[in-house]
Interface confidence: low
């Protein structure tokens, strides 16, 4: 009577030739303790004898008969709760149905468990999340419907044939609900992992290869771009032309839009892979990049620093400090925008060239009254000489000299 027996165990167990099988099992006999237990292989009920026929793998009866399989098959249960079994080693011809024939004082029951034994170690199964995005941590799962105390195994992760650096967490389950070995690997894929092969390798305790499963990574990523510029050093003179080309080295999914940015701001009406700048001015100097978007988001190229070279602009002089008191120190600074930076400066005092003064700064440690006047400068670089600016006035304050009485 089935209502008097309650069993819990995995419906089907999997193993391979030479491994072992551990069958977690619990039961409840409502009318008292177990008196007899027989484990059949592929049992069939014989109506004539009202008994089950089949290979007896294990027998535990009052008269203590022991089949020859007893060493290979172990009943690890008890008389009222536990019906756990172990078969070690397990063979290909063990595949089929295991029948647990249970008898108490008044009741009998045949419980069936499926056993699937393959010729070779079957492969694990890699489970990937539905979508993998670059730089977002995902968990790769490798699941094998096998675990047995007498046959240790390990699951190893490989990326393109090389062990993966990230530490994997392996767990096993040997419960009445499920039997499995699982390895979980937390992994932050980069775009360059797209299309690469990930392998979960089943190995025995000595690291010998048993089987594997492979998947090809589909890593969704923003477009990866390369920017090329002509001339290649991105250094031009005012009035020259510049061409920048944007190349998509990888995009998953396909790209949808293209734009160009200068110093972080989008350039209007520039939506092709080529940016042509004709007769450039110095105001067009700056950091350029292209931006290409797909469904994941925008990707940006490296920045190209465009240097538009020009002769020095009209210079100005800054004086620290004016008015100056006689005997104090004063510094003059020649300010002139130029690219490349000026290599030479010419200084003028009251319209006359100051000999030996060719630096950006002029320092006078001790001001005298005759230092007063207009100071101007001219900056020079490889492209030319700048226009001399209007200059600046130095006022020198000093006490009365040669006081005469009138």
């Amino acid at each position: 009577d089935s209502s008097k027996w309650v069993f819990e165990h995995p419906e089907t167990l999997y193993a391979w030739e030479g491994a072992c099988v551990w069958i977690p099992c619990t039961y409840r006999a409502l009318d008292g303790d177990l008196e007899s237990f027989i484990l059949f292989h592929n049992p069939e009920y014989n109506k004539n004898t009202s008994k089950f026929d089949g290979t007896r793998l294990y027998e535990s009866t009052k008269d203590g008969k022991v089949p020859s399989e007893q060493k290979r098959v172990q009943f690890l249960g008890d008389k009222n709760k536990n019906c756990t079994l172990s078969i070690h080693p397990v063979h290909l011809n063990d595949s089929g149905q295991l029948g647990l024939r249970m008898e108490s004082k008044t009741e009998k029951w045949m419980e069936r468990i499926h056993l699937n034994v393959s010729e070779r170690p079957f492969p694990p199964h890699i489970q990937l999340p539905p979508e993998i995005q670059e730089s977002q941590e995902v968990t790769l799962t490798c699941l094998l419907n096998f675990s047995c105390y007498g046959y240790p195994i390990q699951l190893q992760w490989l990326l393109e044939g090389v062990p993966m650096r990230q530490a994997a967490v392996t767990s096993t389950s040997l419960t009445i609900k499920s039997v499995f070995t699982r390895s979980e690997l937390k992994f932050s894929p980069q775009w360059s992992h797209h299309g690469k092969i990930v392998t979960c390798q089943l190995q025995d305790a000595d690291g010998k290869f048993l089987s594997n499963d492979t998947v090809q990574l589909n890593v969704k990523h923003t477009p990866k771009l390369e920017i090329k510029v002509t001339p290649s050093d991105a250094i031009v003179r005012e009035g020259d032309s510049v061409t920048m080309t944007c190349e998509v080295s990888s995009s998953n999914p396909e790209y949808t839009t293209v734009s160009w940015l200068k110093d972080g701001t989008s350039l209007k009406k520039q939506n092709t892979f080529t940016l042509n700048l004709r007769e450039v001015t110095k105001d067009q100097s700056g950091k350029y990049c292209c931006q290409v978007s797909n469904d994941v988001g925008p990707g940006r190229s490296e920045e190209v620093f465009l240097q538009v070279q020009y002769a020095p602009e009209p210079s100005t002089v800054q004086i620290l400090h004016s008015p100056a008191v006689e005997g104090s120190q004063v510094e003059f600074l020649c300010m002139s925008l130029a690219n490349p930076l000026p290599t030479n400066y010419t200084w003028y005092h009251n319209g006359k060239e100051m000999q030996g003064r060719t630096e950006e700064k002029v320092h006078i440690p001790k001001i005298l009254p005759w230092h007063a006047g207009t100071y101007s400068c001219v900056a020079e670089n490889i492209l030319g000489t700048g226009q001399r600016g209007p200059g600046a006035e130095l006022d020198v304050q000093y006490p009365p000299k040669k006081v005469t009485t009138v």
């Epitope: 990326l159 393109e160 044939g161 090389v162 062990p163 993966m164 650096r165 990230q166 530490a167 932050s188 360059s192 000595d206 690291g207 010998k208």
Partner: antibody
Framework: EVQLVESGGGFVKPGGSLKLSCAAS????????MNWFRQAPEKGLEWVAY????????YYADTVKGRFTISRDNAENTLFLQMTSLRSNDTAMYYC???????????WGQGTSLTVSS | QLVLTQSSSASFSLGASAKLTCTLS???????IEWYQQQPLKPPKYVME???????STGDGIPDRFSGSSSGADRYLSISNIQSEDEAIYIC?????????????FGGGTKVTVLG
């Protein structure tokens, strides 16, 4: 006891060729990826080449790509490094190294010396 | 780019504790690294690997005076009760597969001197 014994080093002229060998013992050779590393006199260590257990995956450092060939004979427990078009900057002590787990280079041979000079 | 940074030298008194640092490039702060010991005219010797969580496993024949730990992108090798035979260059290494190329990168090494 794990042992790695390199041989085949010596003097060679620039442009010449040489083959290094490494005899492994004390462990199951076919269970491990193997590497060649080198160390130039008074310089740091440099990885040269890697070969997987079954020779399916092979990697080379950019400095030797196209000139050096790594191979192994699992039946003979031997690792090889065939070197061609040798240059003076290939002068170094060459080490045969076992790789375990996550890139742990856990056993190193005593090394064999290569001098490339005219 | 995968880079390991080490200080070039360090001195410790006999019997003292030593702590060596190896810093990974910031984008690789989760990587496992390896420590190696190299004594003059000898090949490197594997000391241990150190993981991001600080757990470590030592190589064969390494005394339990050696231990590893971690903080952020820094990986440490600690030697308690340092002995004269511990005088050597300690080099950290890290491997990775980038695009289709395997690389194994070393730090510059820290030369450890034991005083007294």
């Amino acid at each position: 006891e794990v042992q790695l014994v390199e041989s085949g080093g010596g003097f060679v002229k620039p442009g010449g060729s040489l083959k290094l060998s490494c005899a492994a013992s004390g462990f199951t050779f076919s269970d491990y990826g193997m590497n060649w590393f080198r160390q130039a006199p008074e310089k740091g260590l440099e990885w040269v080449a890697y070969i997987s257990r079954g020779s399916h995956t092979i990697y080379y450092a950019d400095t030797v790509k196209g000139r050096f060939t790594i191979s192994r004979d699992n039946a003979e427990n031997t690792l090889f490094l065939q070197m061609t078009s040798l240059r003076s900057n290939d002068t170094a002590m060459y080490y045969c190294v076992r790789m375990a787990g996550y890139y742990a280079m856990d056993y190193w041979g005593q090394g064999t010396s290569l001098t490339v000079s005219s | 780019q995968l880079v390991l940074t080490q200080s070039s030298s360090a001195s410790f008194s006999l019997g003292a504790s030593a702590k060596l640092t190896c810093t990974l490039s910031s984008q690789h702060s989760s990587y496992i690294i390896e420590w190696y010991q190299q004594q003059p005219l000898k090949p490197p010797k594997y000391v241990m690997e150190v993981k991001k969580d600080g757990s470590h496993s030592t190589g064969d024949g390494i005394p339990d005076r050696f231990s590893g730990s971690s903080s952020g992108a820094d990986r440490y090798l600690s030697i308690s009760n340092i002995q004269s035979e511990d005088e050597a260059i300690y080099i950290c290494g890290v491997g990775d597969t980038i695009k289709e190329q395997f690389v194994y990168v070393f730090g510059g090494g820290t030369k450890v001197t034991v005083l007294g």
